[in-house]
Interface confidence: low
Amino acid sequence: VEETLMDSTTATAELGWMVHPPSGWEEVSGYDENMNTIRTYQVCNVFESSQNNWLRTKFIRRRGAHRIHVEMKFSVRDCSSIPSVPGSCKETFNLYYYEADFDSATKTFPNWMENPWVKVDTIAADESFSQVDLGGRVMKINTEVRSFGPVSRSGFYLAFQDYGGCMSLIAVRVFYRKCPRIIQNGAIFQETLSGAESTSLVAARGSCIANAEEVDVPIK
């Protein structure tokens, strides 16, 4: 099962994430694919050169998780559909994370750059949209999931770097995976979190329920 650590769509007020510089990402009310009102972040400085716009989440506690998954819903404007757009227009953005033992971030720390931030991946849209028609909803919503780990400190921040695109970050959900507590074949298996790597197998030792007796050695 998936255990959510943070879901931007549940925000009832402003998300209040940190942006750098102020002329970059902007928090606005938007809509999800079901036309529900949600808080989103948008940036569209395609006609300005040398863009390097960062957006940082609030501190996310890892709650014992070793591997973190990030689901992003976003839309990207098709660069070629913007008249006279410069060649620096982008249809991608970067995802980063930074581990910390407590909520220590400020306007200037961690530095807004790769290292100390750890790059997870460059995120590209499967579908970009060419016309903005909020009435007809031409905008295409993409969903991408990325994971990273192992994480070992109390928590982490995520950052989204735009370097010259026209995009809307519609929803961010951060979660980890675990096997729930189950009773099977007379044994109780406690809740077990997934391993640090995507392919990790974690052995879960069961214990007998009341009036049950172990008759065989568990398979290793």
């Epitope: 559909s81 982008k90 060419s130 016309q131």
Partner: antibody, heavy 119, light 113 residues
Framework: QVQLQQSGAELAKPGASVKMSCKAS????????MHWVKQRPGQGLEWIGF???????TDYNQKFKDKATLTVKSSNTAYMQLSRLTSEDSAVYYC?????????????WGQGTTLTVSA | DIVMTQSPSSLSVSAGEKVTMNCKSS????????????LAWYQQKPGQPPKLLIY???TRESGVPDRFTGSGSGTDFTLTISSVQAEDLAVYYC?????????FGAGTKVEIK
């Protein structure tokens, strides 16, 4: 394999209009933008404009804005209509596809449609 | 519009010789975001449509012989044929793929002696 099959040669009178086609096969038509390029006899190449087949969005070289009209049909075919023809429009016209993000170039071209404008 | 200037306009070489042609753009074709140069080279043989040789200034298109090499950055670019063959008789065009309207150079015609 990828193919862009263009319609045959056209002979037209000054002032008339012509519509040429470019049928795509061997790839997902809506994943690439279709561009059109003009080449006059013994001359270089001139970019006319493009159409995004998934949305119908077009953008033109200002020089051809009142000359060319680009459209697409769901049958994997792109069209270019040239209006108010003059002898200056006599040329070979190529359709060519272009994918953004991976390659910044036009990787496959049609064989060309020759247009002759003559009274 | 970005103006692409190619030189020389033509050259005549013997099979096996090295050929170098230049392309200069009136504005930089370097994308600072991804450090890619949005420049392509095409080969056009008589009676045929252009064929993509090089994109991103230096990346050889699949199936293109390795005797063709693209180099350069910003505003100055070069296409080199290390050992020209008879089948390389063609006009070579560079293209600005950075800004609309896309523009092409006037071409360099390569003739084989």
């Amino acid at each position: 394999q990828v193919q862009l099959q263009q319609s045959g040669a056209e002979l037209a009178k000054p002032g008339a209009s012509v519509k040429m086609s470019c049928k795509a096969s061997g790839y997902t038509f809506t994943s690439y933008w279709m561009h059109w390029v003009k080449q006059r006899p013994g001359q270089g190449l001139e970019w006319i404009g493009f159409i995004n087949p998934s949305t119908g969005y077009t953008d033109y070289n200002q020089k051809f804005k009142d000359k060319a009209t680009l459209t697409v049909k769901s049958s994997n075919t792109a069209y270019m209509q040239l209006s108010r023809l003059t002898s200056e429009d006599s040329a070979v016209y190529y359709c060519t596809r272009r994918l953004k993000l991976l390659r910044y170039a036009m990787d496959y071209w049609g064989q060309g449609t020759t247009l002759t404008v003559s009274a | 519009d970005i103006v692409m200037t190619q030189s020389p306009s033509s050259l005549s070489v013997s099979a096996g010789e090295k050929v170098t042609m230049n392309c200069k753009s009136s504005q930089s074709l370097l994308n600072s975001g991804n450090q890619e140069n949005y420049l392509a080279w095409y080969q056009q043989k008589p009676g045929q449509p252009p064929k993509l040789l090089i994109y991103g200034a230096s990346t050889r298109e699949s199936g293109v012989p390795d005797r063709f090499t693209g180099s350069g950055s910003g505003t100055d670019f070069t296409l080199t044929i290390s050992s020209v063959q008879a089948e390389d008789l063609a006009v070579y065009y560079c293209q600005n793929d950075h800004s609309y309207p896309f523009t092409f150079g006037a071409g360099t015609k390569v003739e084989i002696k």
